[in-house]
Protein backbone atom coordinates (compact mmCIF):
# COMPACT_ATOMS: atom_id res chain seq x y z
CA UNK A 1 0.00 0.00 0.00
CA UNK A 2 2.70 2.63 0.91
CA UNK A 3 4.49 1.65 -2.20
CA UNK A 4 1.50 2.18 -4.32
CA UNK A 5 0.23 5.31 -2.34
CA UNK A 6 2.98 6.61 -0.33
CA UNK A 7 0.57 7.59 2.40
CA UNK A 8 3.02 7.26 5.00
CA UNK A 9 5.42 10.01 3.28
CA UNK A 10 2.51 12.00 2.58
CA UNK A 11 1.00 12.30 6.23
CA UNK A 12 4.51 12.65 7.57
CA UNK A 13 5.45 15.66 5.05
CA UNK A 14 1.79 16.95 5.99
CA UNK A 15 3.02 16.69 10.02
CA UNK A 16 5.94 18.40 9.37
CA UNK A 17 5.02 20.84 6.94
CA UNK A 18 2.45 22.01 9.95
CA UNK A 19 5.36 22.82 12.39
CA UNK A 20 6.06 25.70 9.77
CA UNK A 21 9.71 25.38 10.78
CA UNK A 22 11.64 28.54 9.20
CA UNK A 23 14.98 27.02 9.01
CA UNK A 24 17.33 23.74 9.22
CA UNK A 25 17.69 24.45 13.06
CA UNK A 26 14.35 24.42 14.06
CA UNK A 27 13.78 20.43 13.13
CA UNK A 28 16.09 18.86 16.52
CA UNK A 29 13.43 20.50 18.40
CA UNK A 30 10.77 18.23 17.73
CA UNK A 31 13.51 15.36 17.78
CA UNK A 32 14.40 16.65 21.27
CA UNK A 33 9.89 16.46 22.17
CA UNK A 34 10.27 12.91 21.03
CA UNK A 35 13.33 11.43 22.43
CA UNK A 36 13.96 13.53 25.90
CA UNK A 37 11.66 11.30 27.90
CA UNK A 38 13.09 8.05 26.75
CA UNK A 39 16.70 9.62 27.08
CA UNK A 40 15.68 10.55 31.09
CA UNK A 41 14.85 7.08 31.37
CA UNK A 42 18.53 5.96 30.65
CA UNK A 43 20.44 8.39 32.15
CA UNK A 44 20.30 12.61 33.72
CA UNK A 45 22.96 14.21 33.55
CA UNK A 46 23.81 17.10 36.43
CA UNK A 47 23.90 20.49 34.26
CA UNK A 48 25.37 22.30 37.59
CA UNK A 49 28.71 19.51 37.64
CA UNK A 50 28.90 20.35 33.89
CA UNK A 51 28.70 23.95 34.33
CA UNK A 52 31.27 23.57 36.86
CA UNK A 53 33.57 21.46 34.45
CA UNK A 54 33.35 24.33 31.71
CA UNK A 55 34.14 26.99 34.31
CA UNK A 56 37.32 24.74 35.40
CA UNK A 57 35.85 24.82 38.74
CA UNK A 58 37.96 22.80 41.47
CA UNK A 59 34.91 21.65 43.07
CA UNK A 60 34.01 19.97 40.02
CA UNK A 61 36.55 17.26 40.53
CA UNK A 62 35.08 14.89 42.61
CA UNK A 63 31.57 14.85 41.81
CA UNK A 64 29.79 12.39 39.08
CA UNK A 65 28.01 14.22 35.89
CA UNK A 66 24.81 11.40 36.57
CA UNK A 67 22.31 13.07 38.65
CA UNK A 68 21.21 11.10 41.50
CA UNK A 69 18.66 13.77 43.52
CA UNK A 70 16.26 14.84 41.07
CA UNK A 71 13.83 16.67 44.35
CA UNK A 72 15.88 18.37 46.80
CA UNK A 73 15.13 21.16 49.26
CA UNK A 74 17.00 24.13 49.94
CA UNK A 75 16.93 25.86 53.40
CA UNK A 76 18.91 28.85 53.86
CA UNK A 77 19.45 30.21 57.55
CA UNK A 78 21.75 31.86 59.52
CA UNK A 79 23.95 30.79 62.32
CA UNK A 80 26.29 32.14 64.94
CA UNK A 81 30.21 31.33 64.69
CA UNK A 82 33.35 32.16 66.07
CA UNK A 83 35.76 34.33 64.58
CA UNK A 84 39.48 35.22 65.36
CA UNK A 85 38.83 38.85 65.87
CA UNK A 86 36.25 41.64 64.97
CA UNK A 87 38.61 42.33 62.00
CA UNK A 88 36.99 39.11 60.95
CA UNK A 89 33.49 40.19 60.89
CA UNK A 90 30.60 40.22 58.35
CA UNK A 91 30.32 44.29 59.52
CA UNK A 92 30.79 45.41 63.13
CA UNK A 93 26.81 45.41 64.54
CA UNK A 94 26.57 41.51 63.60
CA UNK A 95 29.43 41.34 65.94
CA UNK A 96 29.75 40.66 69.59
CA UNK A 97 32.17 38.88 71.92
CA UNK A 98 31.26 36.89 75.76
CA UNK A 99 34.52 37.58 76.96
CA UNK A 100 36.17 34.13 75.98
CA UNK A 101 35.22 34.34 71.72
CA UNK A 102 34.06 36.58 69.15
CA UNK A 103 31.06 35.74 67.27
CA UNK A 104 29.48 37.13 64.16
CA UNK A 105 26.20 35.79 62.15
CA UNK A 106 26.81 33.66 59.03
CA UNK A 107 24.17 32.85 56.17
CA UNK A 108 24.36 29.38 55.69
CA UNK A 109 22.65 26.87 52.52
CA UNK A 110 21.60 23.53 54.12
CA UNK A 111 20.74 21.27 51.24
CA UNK A 112 18.42 18.23 52.17
CA UNK A 113 18.08 15.06 49.56
CA UNK A 114 14.08 14.41 48.99
CA UNK A 115 13.58 12.35 46.21
CA UNK A 116 16.16 10.07 43.71
CA UNK A 117 16.10 10.54 39.59
CA UNK A 118 14.53 7.94 37.69
CA UNK A 119 16.79 6.23 35.78
CA UNK A 120 18.44 3.26 35.09
CA UNK A 121 21.98 4.64 36.18
CA UNK A 122 21.01 6.09 39.24
CA UNK A 123 21.82 3.43 41.40
CA UNK A 124 24.78 1.96 39.31
CA UNK A 125 27.65 4.35 41.14
CA UNK A 126 29.85 3.77 38.25
CA UNK A 127 33.09 5.63 37.51
CA UNK A 128 32.33 8.51 34.85
CA UNK A 129 35.18 7.34 32.82
CA UNK B 1 16.12 24.62 86.52
CA UNK B 2 19.74 23.92 86.42
CA UNK B 3 21.86 23.39 89.95
CA UNK B 4 25.18 23.00 90.16
CA UNK B 5 26.67 20.97 92.86
CA UNK B 6 30.76 21.35 93.90
CA UNK B 7 32.67 18.50 95.61
CA UNK B 8 36.09 17.48 96.69
CA UNK B 9 38.53 17.89 99.45
CA UNK B 10 38.07 20.45 101.92
CA UNK B 11 41.90 20.37 102.98
CA UNK B 12 44.75 20.17 100.30
CA UNK B 13 48.27 19.88 101.53
CA UNK B 14 50.80 22.43 99.73
CA UNK B 15 52.66 21.76 96.75
CA UNK B 16 49.87 18.85 95.93
CA UNK B 17 46.58 19.48 93.43
CA UNK B 18 43.33 20.96 93.94
CA UNK B 19 40.88 18.57 92.66
CA UNK B 20 37.36 19.87 92.70
CA UNK B 21 34.42 18.76 90.64
CA UNK B 22 31.00 20.11 89.57
CA UNK B 23 27.62 17.87 88.84
CA UNK B 24 25.52 19.50 86.61
CA UNK B 25 21.47 18.71 87.09
CA UNK B 26 18.49 20.02 84.95
CA UNK B 27 20.83 20.62 82.07
CA UNK B 28 23.69 19.50 79.19
CA UNK B 29 27.53 20.43 79.69
CA UNK B 30 27.04 19.55 76.09
CA UNK B 31 25.50 22.25 74.96
CA UNK B 32 26.70 24.86 72.77
CA UNK B 33 24.93 27.26 74.10
CA UNK B 34 26.65 27.64 77.68
CA UNK B 35 30.80 27.72 79.13
CA UNK B 36 30.75 25.63 82.20
CA UNK B 37 33.22 27.45 84.53
CA UNK B 38 35.45 27.98 87.57
CA UNK B 39 35.62 31.21 90.03
CA UNK B 40 37.20 31.29 93.31
CA UNK B 41 36.95 33.77 96.43
CA UNK B 42 39.81 33.55 99.08
CA UNK B 43 38.16 34.69 102.70
CA UNK B 44 37.36 38.57 102.63
CA UNK B 45 38.15 39.06 99.69
CA UNK B 46 37.20 39.46 95.74
CA UNK B 47 35.96 36.90 92.97
CA UNK B 48 38.51 35.64 90.53
CA UNK B 49 37.66 33.74 87.10
CA UNK B 50 39.34 30.85 87.03
CA UNK B 51 38.93 29.45 83.54
CA UNK B 52 36.33 27.86 81.62
CA UNK B 53 34.89 24.85 79.20
CA UNK B 54 32.94 24.71 76.57
CA UNK B 55 31.21 22.60 74.06
CA UNK B 56 33.90 19.59 72.44
CA UNK B 57 35.84 20.43 75.55
CA UNK B 58 37.77 23.71 74.32
CA UNK B 59 39.21 25.44 77.34
CA UNK B 60 39.74 28.51 78.47
CA UNK B 61 41.84 29.78 81.45
CA UNK B 62 42.62 32.70 83.36
CA UNK B 63 46.47 33.84 81.68
CA UNK B 64 47.78 34.48 85.24
CA UNK B 65 46.67 30.71 86.50
CA UNK B 66 47.31 29.18 83.01
CA UNK B 67 50.03 27.36 83.47
CA UNK B 68 48.73 25.20 86.99
CA UNK B 69 45.33 24.74 85.97
CA UNK B 70 43.81 21.71 84.55
CA UNK B 71 39.64 21.73 83.59
CA UNK B 72 37.70 19.08 81.59
CA UNK B 73 34.85 17.33 81.70
CA UNK B 74 33.05 14.06 81.36
CA UNK B 75 29.31 14.22 79.83
CA UNK B 76 28.74 10.60 79.80
CA UNK B 77 28.27 11.84 83.97
CA UNK B 78 27.26 15.59 83.23
CA UNK B 79 30.38 16.64 85.38
CA UNK B 80 33.54 19.23 84.93
CA UNK B 81 36.06 19.40 86.86
CA UNK B 82 38.77 21.82 88.39
CA UNK B 83 42.70 20.67 88.62
CA UNK B 84 45.05 23.55 90.32
CA UNK B 85 48.75 21.92 90.67
CA UNK B 86 51.19 23.31 93.37
CA UNK B 87 49.17 25.00 95.12
CA UNK B 88 50.19 27.40 98.49
CA UNK B 89 48.18 28.51 101.33
CA UNK B 90 47.49 31.78 98.53
CA UNK B 91 45.12 29.27 97.08
CA UNK B 92 42.95 28.63 100.02
CA UNK B 93 39.69 29.86 98.67
CA UNK B 94 35.83 29.00 98.02
CA UNK B 95 36.04 27.46 94.65
CA UNK B 96 31.85 27.77 92.84
CA UNK B 97 31.20 26.08 89.75
CA UNK B 98 29.52 28.25 87.40
CA UNK B 99 27.27 28.83 83.88
CA UNK B 100 27.79 31.63 82.06
CA UNK B 101 26.24 31.69 77.89
CA UNK B 102 27.71 31.55 75.31
CA UNK B 103 27.89 33.89 72.28
CA UNK B 104 26.35 30.78 70.61
CA UNK B 105 22.93 31.63 71.88
CA UNK B 106 23.26 35.00 73.13
CA UNK B 107 24.96 38.56 72.44
CA UNK B 108 25.76 39.06 76.40
CA UNK B 109 26.85 36.96 79.18
CA UNK B 110 27.28 36.75 82.64
CA UNK B 111 27.48 34.45 85.21
CA UNK B 112 24.07 33.23 85.62
CA UNK B 113 24.12 30.43 87.57
CA UNK B 114 26.46 29.18 90.12
CA UNK B 115 26.97 26.27 92.95
CA UNK B 116 26.59 26.80 96.49
CA UNK B 117 30.70 27.22 96.49
CA UNK B 118 33.01 24.71 98.54
CA UNK B 119 35.84 26.17 100.88
CA UNK B 120 39.50 24.86 100.22
CA UNK B 121 42.31 24.83 102.73
CA UNK B 122 45.56 24.38 101.92
CA UNK B 123 47.69 23.86 104.98
CA UNK B 124 50.14 21.13 105.78
CA UNK C 1 43.96 42.28 81.24
CA UNK C 2 41.08 44.71 81.93
CA UNK C 3 41.02 46.26 84.98
CA UNK C 4 37.56 47.52 87.00
CA UNK C 5 37.41 49.95 89.77
CA UNK C 6 34.80 50.04 92.07
CA UNK C 7 33.56 53.62 94.26
CA UNK C 8 33.11 53.29 96.68
CA UNK C 9 34.62 50.72 98.31
CA UNK C 10 31.94 50.68 100.75
CA UNK C 11 29.43 52.83 102.48
CA UNK C 12 26.25 52.98 104.67
CA UNK C 13 22.97 53.98 104.34
CA UNK C 14 19.43 53.82 105.53
CA UNK C 15 16.41 51.84 104.90
CA UNK C 16 14.43 53.77 101.92
CA UNK C 17 17.56 55.30 100.42
CA UNK C 18 18.83 55.88 97.16
CA UNK C 19 22.29 54.28 96.56
CA UNK C 20 24.23 54.56 93.47
CA UNK C 21 27.35 52.37 93.45
CA UNK C 22 30.05 52.81 90.38
CA UNK C 23 32.30 51.04 88.33
CA UNK C 24 34.83 52.40 85.51
CA UNK C 25 36.90 50.37 83.49
CA UNK C 26 40.71 50.76 82.41
CA UNK C 27 39.47 50.82 78.80
CA UNK C 28 36.12 50.87 76.57
CA UNK C 29 34.25 47.45 77.38
CA UNK C 30 30.96 48.84 75.31
CA UNK C 31 27.68 47.82 77.25
CA UNK C 32 29.88 44.43 78.40
CA UNK C 33 29.25 44.69 82.22
CA UNK C 34 27.49 42.55 84.83
CA UNK C 35 26.23 43.29 88.38
CA UNK C 36 26.26 40.93 90.94
CA UNK C 37 24.82 40.74 94.92
CA UNK C 38 26.47 38.59 97.07
CA UNK C 39 25.75 38.29 101.07
CA UNK C 40 28.11 36.80 103.62
CA UNK C 41 28.05 32.78 103.17
CA UNK C 42 26.22 32.63 99.84
CA UNK C 43 27.70 32.35 96.08
CA UNK C 44 26.94 35.73 93.98
CA UNK C 45 23.89 36.27 92.70
CA UNK C 46 23.11 37.94 88.88
CA UNK C 47 21.60 41.57 89.25
CA UNK C 48 21.97 43.02 85.72
CA UNK C 49 23.71 41.86 82.45
CA UNK C 50 24.89 44.07 79.53
CA UNK C 51 25.04 47.11 81.55
CA UNK C 52 21.28 47.63 81.49
CA UNK C 53 19.03 44.72 81.71
CA UNK C 54 17.20 43.06 84.77
CA UNK C 55 17.50 39.31 85.67
CA UNK C 56 14.17 37.51 86.02
CA UNK C 57 13.45 37.57 89.17
CA UNK C 58 15.67 40.54 90.73
CA UNK C 59 13.14 43.61 92.49
CA UNK C 60 12.79 46.64 90.15
CA UNK C 61 14.78 48.74 92.48
CA UNK C 62 17.63 47.67 91.02
CA UNK C 63 18.66 49.50 87.53
CA UNK C 64 22.36 49.67 85.57
CA UNK C 65 23.22 52.18 83.12
CA UNK C 66 26.39 52.87 81.65
CA UNK C 67 28.70 52.85 78.44
CA UNK C 68 32.28 52.70 77.07
CA UNK C 69 34.04 52.97 80.88
CA UNK C 70 31.82 54.14 82.98
CA UNK C 71 28.54 52.25 84.61
CA UNK C 72 26.51 52.44 87.61
CA UNK C 73 24.20 50.16 89.73
CA UNK C 74 21.46 52.36 91.48
CA UNK C 75 19.07 50.57 94.04
CA UNK C 76 16.04 52.84 94.12
CA UNK C 77 14.92 52.54 97.73
CA UNK C 78 16.93 50.18 100.16
CA UNK C 79 15.13 47.32 101.71
CA UNK C 80 16.62 45.44 104.44
CA UNK C 81 17.16 42.35 102.41
CA UNK C 82 19.67 44.72 100.17
CA UNK C 83 22.79 45.09 102.43
CA UNK C 84 25.76 43.31 101.02
CA UNK C 85 28.27 43.43 98.92
CA UNK C 86 28.17 44.06 95.12
CA UNK C 87 30.51 43.29 92.84
CA UNK C 88 30.74 44.49 88.58
CA UNK C 89 32.21 42.21 86.00
CA UNK C 90 33.50 42.49 82.27
CA UNK C 91 32.47 39.98 79.66
CA UNK C 92 34.13 41.88 76.84
CA UNK C 93 38.20 40.71 77.11
CA UNK C 94 38.42 37.55 79.51
CA UNK C 95 36.23 37.95 82.52
CA UNK C 96 37.83 39.80 85.24
CA UNK C 97 35.43 41.70 88.26
CA UNK C 98 35.56 44.36 90.24
CA UNK C 99 36.95 44.60 93.46
CA UNK C 100 33.52 44.82 94.99
CA UNK C 101 31.79 47.49 96.85
CA UNK C 102 30.50 46.74 100.64
CA UNK C 103 27.21 48.25 101.33
CA UNK C 104 26.31 48.67 105.38
CA UNK C 105 23.35 49.74 107.54
CA UNK C 106 23.74 53.50 108.65
Known amino acids: VEVATHYLEIITQLIVESFHFKNGEDAPDLLKVITKPFTKLIVQLDKKVISQIAMNDEKAKNKSLVKIWCKTFTNKTQINVTVPSTANCTSPSLCWTDGIQNWTMKNVTYKENIAKCQHIFVNFHLPDL | QVQLQESGPELVKPSETLSITCTVSGGSISSRSYYWGWIRQPPGKGLEWIGSIYYGGSTYYNPSLKSRVTISADTSKNQFSLKLNSVTAADTAVFYC????????????????WGQGTMVTVSS | EIVLTQSPSSLSASVGDRVTITCRASQSISSYLNWYQQKPGRAPELLIY???SLQSGVPSRFSGSGSGTDFTLTISSLQPEDFATYYC????????FGQGTRLEIK
Open chain 3, 50 to 52: AAS
Open chain 3, 89 to 96: QQSFSSLT
Open chain 2, 98 to 113: VRHPAGYSTRWSAFDI
